[in-house]
């Protein structure tokens, strides 16, 4: 029996700048029923503070909701291991909310093969912006990536669409359905996971040519 | 709505106890840092207590470090402040206060009032 | 601890008029400070947190500015219910402090 080891804070993630999660691995355990809590301060405070929410965000995480989150204040925190036999700290982890955000995937995905008259047909998509964060605060800037491939092909074709939240494709091999995804990422920050595919089937006289 | 009452306060003579609750409602008490601040027409407004969510993290003023105790039961959401060895200077408006916003306490009970006095 | 002085002590105005209040602390407190009413027999009321940040339900008449050591709580038109007493506060390090307080009162 010993006392815990050492644990980690691996990630800490916010969907918009407005809450953040934190989550961390526990050390070992010694062989004893071990308790953890996560306290913190923020930069220029030397009042220390609790966890507010270790429920949200599953186990060993700590979710801090609206009225605990600043943009503008950077966060030190560890997170304590405790058992019978003593206790154990995680490293201090200095987190800027600005630089953790994962927003949700893109919303309201929609493909559609444009065949105009006059011009060479092209594959039209369009998306929406994640729900939880809103643009015209100016607070964010998001980025689009697409993902398209052939239903049956290994390899994605990726396309950046920088700012804009419609896209046009027109290389594409006739008669073949596709599986198209998009996902979004601040400008500090990480990429969202993708959206669930759209498929699309792509008609047989559709035209490569350029 | 949220409501915060205290009660428990009283005259006590210089050396006896009293033990102060505070019951909450009207939110997540469990997550919430909570506070004793008491008010004297001497000294004002003097903050003498604070527990964190969970107990983990407790602070006292030196004014009543090794006298007074904070306590909690978030299953009943319930604050507690238990006075030891009282003297005539902790008499006192006693209020409790949960924080909501950074740690500034938004709500306030109406506070009890604590006599010391023999 | 960090001491906190509130100039002035009483401040006369008439309705309609601007208030300002001033705070000082004895070592800096970053923007972890805040103001509070108090009006006789109630518990204090939240006004500013952070400095300049409203509390909810709080007029826009009320405003907080400083950052440090020095900070101002400004009403911009006073009106009739704001005649109380207003105490800043820090809540950078334990133990958290107020200032004695600054009595606004009708002139």
């Known amino acids: 029996q010993l006392p815990p080891g050492k644990p980690e804070i691996f990630k800490c993630r916010s969907p918009n700048k407005e809450t953040f999660t934190c989550w961390w691995r526990p050390g070992t355990d010694g062989g004893l029923p071990t308790n953890y809590s996560l306290t913190y301060h923020r930069e220029g405070e030397t009042l220390m503070h609790e966890c507010p929410d270790y429920i949200t965000g599953g186990p060993n995480s700590c979710h801090f909701g609206k009225q605990y989150t600043s943009m503008w204040r950077t966060y030190i925190m560890m997170v304590n291991a405790t058992n019978q036999m003593g206790s154990s700290f995680s490293d201090e982890l200095y987190v800027d909310v600005t630089y953790i955000v994962q927003p949700d995937p893109p919303l309201e995905l929609a493909v559609e093969v444009k065949q105009p008259e006059d011009r060479k047909p092209y594959l039209w998509i369009k998306w929406s912006p994640p729900t939880l964060i809103d643009l015209k605060t100016g607070w964010f800037t998001l980025l689009y990536e697409i993902r398209l491939k052939p239903e049956k092909a290994a390899e994605w074709e990726i396309h950046f669409a920088g700012q804009q939240t419609e896209f046009k494709i027109l290389s594409l091999h006739p008669g073949q359905k596709y599986l198209v995804q998009v996902r979004c990422k601040p400008d500090h920050g990480y990429w969202s996971a993708w959206s669930p595919a759209t498929f699309i089937q792509i008609p047989s006289d559709f035209t490569m040519n350029d | 709505e949220v409501h915060l009452v205290e009660s428990g306060g009283g005259l006590v003579q210089p050396g006896g106890s009293l033990r102060l609750s505070c019951a909450a409602s009207?939110?997540?008490?469990?997550?919430?840092?909570m506070n004793w601040v008491r008010q004297t027409p001497g000294k004002g407004l003097e903050w003498i207590s604070h527990i964190s969510s969970r107990s983990v993290i407790i602070y006292y003023a030196d004014s009543v470090k090794g006298r007074f105790t904070i306590s909690r039961d978030n299953a009943k959401n319930s604050l507690f402040l238990q006075m030891n060895s009282l003297r005539a200077e902790d008499t006192a408006v006693y209020f409790c206060a949960g924080i909501t916003i950074f740690g500034i306490p938004e709500y306030w009970g109406q506070g009890t009032l604590v006599t010391v006095s023999s | 601890e960090i001491v906190l002085t509130q100039s002035p002590a009483t401040l006369s105005l008439s309705p309609g008029e601007r208030a300002t209040l001033s705070c000082r602390a004895s070592q800096s407190v970053s923007s972890y400070f805040a103001w509070y009413q108090q009006k006789p027999g109630q518990a204090p009321r939240l006004l500013i947190y952070d400095a300049s940040s409203r509390a909810t339900g709080i007029p826009t008449r009320f405003s907080g500015s400083g950052s440090g050591t020095d900070f101002t709580l400004t009403i911009s038109s006073l009106e009739p219910e704001d005649f109380a007493v207003y105490y800043c506060?820090?809540?950078?390090?334990?133990?958290?402090?107020f200032g004695q307080g600054t009595r606004l009162e009708i002139k």
């Open positions: 009207g939110f997540t008490f469990s997550s919430y840092e």
């Open positions: 506060q820090q809540r950078s390090s334990w133990p958290i402090t």
